[in-house]
Interface confidence: low
């Protein structure tokens, strides 16, 4: 028996369903009776699913797993996970028994898209040119880590003062802050983009400086 | 089905520091978060944080920010919550809680025996 | 923080009537609701989730509905395993609050 996943990994957002790819190809006259098909943790080893004695026999992994029982009989082995969470990414085995075996894994890429930043300046009134200022651009609830970029009015990329931390929270989801300390000018915009490198989402901010009042 | 059992009960005095714990078994720990929820006698419940041992993140209540530490030791699937600077109201019992392998990191499922903690001087 | 006000505080009621008790968040949770249910020196046990599933093993009689800021647990025909505490607990944000409780007692 041969087993085929896909090669590239499966990208699922968190809270979405995800279906890991697996196939086989069945003999002439095979019935389900013969199939041990077991799904479970690359690393780890820990059991996933399994179909094993003619029978589904159940998830063994947070109880969100599901196969597809009509297409089994065609070679469908590909696994239905619920509810997506961030620790579900990873490497998946999928096992498949008959006469003989064989197995492939897949990878799970979870990801979560970032929210529109929302931007504030320090300090925010009684302004002038030459002033030192820190404008914090926060966006949150993504995941993986985000790419963030800052440019100024012109579209000139800001590199200098600038200081990005992540943190993760209690669902795994990131929450990022970056702090842009700059000089002001007579005006100017600030831009901030935040990146979510799998999805290619890009979440806007910005603050344009106009003597009074700001604008966000 | 996952089981939570927790130490035994204390009796400490005002401004020391107490270590609760709290050992899972039945499913897998490192997946699941663990909460810890107090209730003080007669009155209701309060959530005071909790961990993910798969992703060794704390977060705490902001009420107890700086005096709770929650730790999770994987090789043993125990979970830990210290409180310091003890003080007569902390006077509860203290439990810990989950969401199992089958619910959420925000519900709970599976509770512990809970803890009584007496402050007294 | 998301305060939860749960009333009322107390409940007499009899076997087998119709108890209704509501709880109110400060703010919207959506359906991200959870009811529990606990004796004296027992740890609570969870009866609802996302304000309307029961959970698995909880008898039908209980009910959970609303989502927003209302939310009630209705009990169809109160049973004498019933007289307990009733707690609501938001999971919208952290940190997770509870209600109260309501107490419900034999009249």
């Known amino acids: 028996v041969e087993v085929q996943v896909s090669e590239d990994p499966v990208v699922a957002l968190v809270d979405t369903d995800a279906t890991l790819r697996c196939s086989f190809s069945p003999e002439p006259g095979f019935s389900l009776a013969q199939l041990n098909l077991i799904w479970q943790l690359t690393d780890t080893k820990q059991l996933v699913h399994s179909f094993t004695e003619g029978r589904d026999q159940g998830s063994a992994y947070s109880n969100r797993t599901a196969l597809f029982p009509d297409l089994l009989v065609q070679g469908n082995a590909s696994l239905r996970l619920q509810r997506v969470r961030v620790t579900d990414e990873g490497s998946y085995t999928c096992f498949v028994s008959i006469q003989d075996f064989d197995s492939a894994a897949v990878s799970l890429q979870v990801a979560a898209p970032y929210s529109k930043p929302s931007m504030t300046l320090e300090p925010n009134k009684d302004l002038r040119p030459g002033n030192m200022v820190t404008i914090t651009c926060s966006s949150y609830q993504g995941y993986p880590e985000a790419e963030v970029f800052w440019k100024d009015g012109q579209g000139v990329p800001l590199t200098g003062n600038v200081t990005t931390s992540q943190m993760a929270n209690e669902r795994g989801l990131f929450d990022v802050h970056s702090v842009l300390r700059v000089v002001l000018g007579a005006n100017g915009t600030y831009s901030c983009l935040v990146r979510n490198p799998v999805l290619q989402q890009d979440a806007h901010g910005s603050v344009t400086i106009t003597g009074q009042p700001l604008t966000f | 089905q996952v089981q939570l059992v927790e130490s035994g009960a204390e009796v400490k005095k005002p401004g020391s520091s107490v270590k609760v714990s709290c050992k899972a078994s039945g499913g897998t720990f490192s997946s699941y978060a663990i909460s810890w929820v107090r209730q003080a006698p007669g009155q209701g419940l309060e959530w005071m944080g909790r961990?993910?041992?798969?992703?060794?993140?704390?977060n705490y209540a902001q009420k107890f920010q700086g005096r709770v530490t929650i730790t999770a030791d994987k090789s043993t699937s125990t979970a830990y919550m210290e409180l310091s600077s003890l003080r007569s109201e902390d006077t509860a019992v203290y439990y810990c809680a989950n969401g199992g392998d089958s619910s959420s990191w925000y519900t709970f499922d599976y509770w512990g025996q809970g803890t009584l903690i007496t402050v007294s001087s | 923080d998301i305060q939860m006000t749960q009333s009322p505080s107390t409940l007499s009621a009899s076997v087998g009537d119709r108890l209704t008790i509501t709880c109110r968040a400060s703010q919207n949770i959506n359906s991200w609701l959870a009811w529990y249910q606990q004796k004296p020196g027992k740890a609570p046990k969870l009866l609802i989730y996302k304000a309307s599933y029961l959970q698995t093993g909880v008898p039908s009689r209980f009910s959970g509905s609303g989502s927003g800021t209302e939310f009630t647990l209705t009990i169809t025909s109160l049973q004498p395993d019933d007289f307990a505490s009733y707690y609501c607990?938001?999971?919208?944000?952290?940190?997770?609050?509870f209600g109260g409780g309501t107490k419900v007692e034999i009249k």
């Open positions: 961990i993910i041992p798969i992703l060794g993140i704390a």
């Open positions: 607990q938001q999971y919208d944000s952290n940190p997770l609050t």
